[in-house]
Structure formats: structure tokens, C-alpha cells
């Protein structure tokens, strides 16, 4: 039976040209996390393996950076990464956990980021 | 004692293919991630390719992608790289190694390598 | 992808000298940097990883630290068995590169 829950950022906003931390924390369950996907809605962005460590799609690799932690920071934003993003959770024996963000970039320089989320 | 046996190595013309095995024993094979590394005569180090402990996730260097394959079975404690449409810049002594999830992802153990010669 | 450079590519030192190996990272890496040690004909051999963690059964002259962008590993006493070519490593993303080297001979 799966009993973990995923947190998030939830949605979020950033400026056009800035950056954005994508947070999701996997919680209520003792199963080991094996690997965790990044991806953007049919794309994939990064994983994080627990035996490799992380590796970028190359497609991603100038403006995604690994972590903090099982998170993805994303740079040099542009209007076009404007969507949703899914943390999915690679775990045993519980099997897959799926976590949503979406992201919005403005234009304005008053975009209002969303509450940062901390891992503990 | 943590032990790593390359075979496989030889002479191959340019175009050619070669399975390179690696024996380990002494640790749960299944339990770490592993990769190869090599090292062209009388230069560095580089990165080939790792793959998980369960087998399930695979990375590759751009150099090679396409044309080498890793895997492992697990119920023979032995890793394979298999290489097709060999280069002469392919040439180099191949290591195997375990990765060391715990240990930031370092290469923690080496086998004692075997060297691929890609000439006609 | 990450551009790890090495500096020197080689040096000249004697027995219980302090020798200093620098690694600079093209971006920050954090803590994700381990160094090797190699000598002609064998396999590498893990010294320090996470930065300046001590692999098992390496001796305590070997240290390393740094983070971010820059590191160092200090042989505190250099020994005749430290003669040696030494390799830095990212393990922060693949491709997982290494420094080009930096050789370590009897002055």
C-alpha cells in the first residue's frame, strides 16, 4: 500500500531571465527512493539516480542545474518554460509517486515567487 | 576483498564490435552502481558509461552514444560493455569501476583494466 | 558540460615536501569533487571524495578540500611511494569529467 505524499512548490511565478528553484519532498513513507525524474510535460529534464547521481538531458544542459538536493534549479528563464513540471518519485517497494508545479514566467519585473518550499 | 577482472580486450579493425565483460565479487554487485572508464595511451581519464545497480538506468558519454551499450546480470556478478562501429579513437585501456552511491558517486574500487586497439 | 582544469600539469618535488594540486570546476560543483591517484600501468585509486573526505585505508598526509568551483588536494609529506600522477573528478552531473592530470615526480 502506498503512503508517501508528495510536497511541492505548487505554482509558482519568476521573471523572464531569472531563475527558480523546483522543490518536491517525498514524505509519510519509509520506502527508498531510487530515482527521481524531472520532467516537463513530455519531456524529460534531468533524473537522479541513487546509485549514478544526476545526469541532464542534453537538450536541458545549459540552463538546468542539479539540485538543491532531489531538486532542479532552472536558469535563464524564458516565457517558453511556462507550463507544468512532475517530480516523479522512483521508490521501493512503493513503487512510483508523482508530484505537480506550475510554473509561470512574466515578463514584468514584479513577478511574485511563489512561498520557497525547504527541504528538511 | 572487493575484486573487479576485465576481459575481452583486443585487436579490432575500425567498424568492428567487441564485448568487454567485468567479473566482480567480494560485495553485493546488485546493490551498486558500476561504470567504465578509459584511457587512451599516454592520456587521461574519461568517462564512458554507468549504469544502476538494478540495471533499469543508463548514461553514456556523447562520444559514444549510439554505438556502446552497458549492462549487467546481476545473477553473474558481471557488467558488459559492448562496442560497435569501433574508432581508431576508441583506442585505450577500459576500466570498470564501482560506483559509490554513498560516497558522492565516486568510483570507489577499479579493475585492472584491458586494452581495446581499434586499427587495420 | 563541466570543464575541469588541473593545474600544474606536472611538478618536481622531493621526499617531505608539501605538495599542493589544484582543480577548477567551469562552474559550481559544490562538494561533488573526488581525486585519484595513478601510478604507470595500474588502475587509479580513489584518495578523497566528496571534497575532502578520506577514501578507507589512505594515509592521513592526503587531504582535499574546497567547494563551489575550487579545490585542492595537499600531500602533507610527500612519501616515495606519492610518485604518482593525481586526477580530479566531478561527480556532480554526466558527463562525470575529469581534470587533465598532474604529475607528481622526483625532484
Known amino acids: 500500500m502506498m503512503t508517501g505524499t508528495i510536497e511541492t512548490t505548487g505554482n509558482i511565478s519568476a521573471e523572464k531571465g531569472g531563475s527558480i528553484i523546483l522543490q518536491c519532498h517525498l514524505s509519510s513513507t519509509t520506502a527508498q527512493v531510487t530515482q527521481v525524474n524531472w520532467e516537463q510535460q513530455d519531456q524529460l529534464l534531468a533524473i537522479c539516480n541513487a546509485d549514478l547521481g544526476w545526469h541532464i538531458s542534453p537538450s536541458f544542459k545549459d540552463r538546468v542545474a542539479p539540485g538543491p538536493g532531489l531538486g532542479l534549479t532552472l536558469q535563464s528563464l524564458t516565457v517558453n518554460d511556462t507550463g507544468e513540471y512532475f517530480c516523479i518519485y522512483h521508490t521501493y517497494p512503493d513503487g512510483t509517486y508523482t508530484g505537480r508545479i506550475f510554473l509561470e514566467v512574466l515578463e514584468s519585473s514584479v513577478a511574485e515567487h511563489g512561498a520557497r518550499f525547504q527541504i528538511p | 576483498e572487493v575484486q573487479l577482472l576485465e576481459s575481452g580486450g583486443g585487436l579490432v579493425q575500425p567498424g568492428g564490435s567487441l564485448r568487454l565483460s567485468c567479473a566482480a565479487s567480494?560485495?553485493?554487485?546488485?546493490?551498486?552502481?558500476m561504470s567504465w572508464v578509459r584511457q587512451a595511451p599516454g592520456k587521461g581519464l574519461e568517462w564512458v558509461s554507468s549504469i544502476s545497480g538494478s540495471g533499469s538506468t543508463t548514461y553514456y558519454a556523447d562520444s559514444v552514444k549510439g554505438r556502446f551499450t552497458i549492462s549487467r546480470d546481476n545473477s553473474k556478478n558481471t557488467l558488459y560493455l559492448q562496442m560497435n562501429s569501433l574508432r581508431a579513437e576508441d583506442t585505450a585501456v577500459y576500466y570498470c569501476?564501482?560506483?559509490?552511491?554513498?560516497?558522492?558517486?565516486?568510483?570507489?574500487?577499479w579493475g585492472q583494466g584491458t586494452l581495446v586497439t581499434v586499427s587495420s | 558540460d563541466i570543464q575541469m582544469t588541473q593545474s600544474p600539469s606536472s611538478l618536481s618535488a622531493s621526499v617531505g615536501d608539501r605538495v599542493t594540486i589544484t582543480c577548477r570546476a567551469s562552474q559550481a560543483i559544490s562538494n561533488y569533487l573526488n581525486w585519484y591517484q595513478q601510478k604507470p600501468g595500474k588502475a587509479p585509486k580513489l584518495l578523497i571524495y566528496?571534497?575532502?573526505r578520506l577514501q578507507s585505508g589512505v594515509p592521513s598526509r592526503f587531504s582535499g578540500s574546497g567547494s563551489g568551483t575550487d579545490f585542492t588536494l595537499t600531500i602533507s609529506s610527500l612519501q616515495p611511494e606519492d610518485f604518482a600522477t593525481y586526477y580530479c573528478?566531478?561527480?556532480?552531473?554526466?558527463?562525470?569529467?575529469f581534470g587533465g592530470g598532474t604529475k607528481v615526480e622526483i625532484k
Open positions: 566528496a571534497a575532502s
Open positions: 567480494g560485495f553485493t554487485f546488485g546493490s551498486y552502481g
Open positions: 573528478q566531478e561527480s556532480y552531473s554526466t558527463p562525470f569529467t
Open positions: 569501476a564501482r560506483v559509490a552511491g554513498s560516497s558522492g558517486w565516486a568510483f570507489d574500487y
